[in-house]
């Protein structure tokens, strides 16, 4: 019996199309596939960022695969050909591995890259990123921000920089059409007359960095003798009510502090006959239905009511 062998894929490479971390892995069929014309050859692809513990494994019939990577680190990938058992009258046959690596040659020392990069998607409408210059860089250093997400045909540069002393320290983004629920890639690079500047790469999803506006129109009604209903309205903007979770801070007579999280725009509070005054503030965040994470809004303006006045209103009604 002659042992069945198959060659690894040819021309395996990692291609950078300039999308700031979204890379193409591509290859050609192995040599000498003539013996297996009736067979559907598959490929097992493994890839990871260098330094990562685990490989991502994909089995595909295609000759390419695309995914996002962290370009602050190198990338390694390997691939081999799989002949299913149907083709070999027995067990699956695997070729040896073909390997490929990719990294961007780092310029400058790590300290020159931007520090404390922070991006917030205000009210699911306006994206703003800010950073601090690298350690020990001179005032002649300037940073430039580029971004890309699936739907753009190329990476775009920021056109509205936030500047301090002529130095770019942030970016106000334009309206970003169809940009949520997908990876959003950013590169901040820099230039200086005196020394090379290290680039930095960031990836996140916009729905996970939303900071809503605070809730508005806080009201308070007495439902019964010892029950108070607190109500508020969702903030203006594109975020639907079902996407909010709220945190309420309630103060009774400047002593008791209750903090609770609720899903709806109402909260019923039990009070005692000793309660004289009631104050509350509310803040909002995008909930688990609409994001994996989020940023709490600022607190609403504080609203206070005298319980006696509420009771009078209730009795009148």
């Amino acid at each position: 019996d002659t042992e069945i062998k198959v060659n690894p894929p040819q021309d395996f490479e990692i291609v950078d199309p300039g999308y700031l971390g979204y890379l193409y892995l591509q290859w050609q069929p192995p040599l000498s596939l003539d013996n297996f014309k009736e067979c559907t050859v598959e490929y097992e692809l493994k890839y990871r960022n260098i330094g990562s513990e685990t490989w991502t494994t994909i089995i595909t019939k295609n000759l390419h695969y695309k995914d996002g990577f962290d370009l602050n680190k190198g990338i390694e990938a390997k691939i081999h050909t799989l002949l299913p058992w149907q083709c070999t009258n027995g067990s699956e046959v695997q070729s040896s591995w073909a390997e490929a690596t990719y990294w961007i040659s780092p310029q400058g020392i790590p300290e020159t890259k931007v520090q404390d990069m922070d991006c917030v998607y205000y009210n699911w409408q306006y994206l703003l990123c800010s950073w601090k210059p690298g350690i020990g860089v001179l005032l002649d250093t300037n940073y430039n921000l580029f971004y890309w997400y699936e739907g753009l045909d190329r990476a775009l540069q920021c056109v509205d920089y936030i500047k301090v002393d002529g130095q770019n320290i942030g970016c106000r983004f334009p309206y970003l059409e169809s940009s949520d629920y997908k990876d959003f890639y950013i590169c901040v690079n820099g230039s200086s007359e005196t020394k090379p500047i290290r680039s930095s790469y960031f990836t996140f999803q916009l729905q996970n960095i939303v900071k809503p506006l605070p809730p508005v129109c806080l009201t308070c009604t007495q439902e019964s003798l010892y029950e108070i209903k607190l109500k508020w309205s969702i903030p203006l903007g594109p975020i639907p009510a079902r996407c909010f979770v709220y945190e309420i801070e309630i103060r009774e007579d400047d002593t008791t502090l209750v903090t609770t999280t609720v899903e709806n725009e109402t909260y019923t509070l039990k009070i005692t006959n000793e309660t004289r005054q009631l104050c509350f503030v509310v803040r909002s965040k995008v909930n688990i239905y609409c994001s994996d994470d989020g940023i709490w809004s600022e607190w609403s303006d504080k609203q206070c009511w005298e319980v006696e006045e509420l009771l009078k209103k209730t009795l009148l009604l």
Partner: nanobody
């Protein structure tokens, strides 16, 4: 039209376990979160657990440590594993799949905890 179908409810003794499933007829799981709610007779509907599209979870204090929510996006199905059930867990359990564009509810499945 997307539909959600709960299953796995039934009668169980205190201390027992049940696993509820919520199957969606369309592929709406990818970017949407899902939650399990319950409503006992004469009480308001309350959320017992929720899971984001990326797998972050939240639980009501009354079920923390006993219930586990999970999801299988490939199968368009969500699950609620309920252990150490108590009589006060008796209710109709509903699943909800929602997001910025969508909001779908199932018809509910009855869970009764009684000896």
């Amino acid at each position: 039209q997307v539909q959600l179908q709960e299953s796995g409810g039934g009668l169980v003794q205190p201390g027992g376990s049940l696993r509820l499933s919520c199957a969606a007829s369309g592929s709406i799981f990818n970017t949407n979160g899902m939650g399990w709610y319950r409503q006992a007779p004469g009480k308001q509907r309350e959320r017992v657990a929720g899971i984001s599209s990326g797998g972050n979870t939240v639980y009501a204090a009354s079920v923390e440590g006993r219930f586990t929510i999970s999801r299988d996006n490939a199968k368009n199905t969500g699950y609620l594993q309920m252990n150490n059930l108590k009589p006060e867990d008796t209710a109709v359990y509903y699943c909800r799949v929602a997001g910025r564009q969508d909001d779908y509810w199932g018809q509910g499945t009855q869970v009764t905890v009684s000896s």
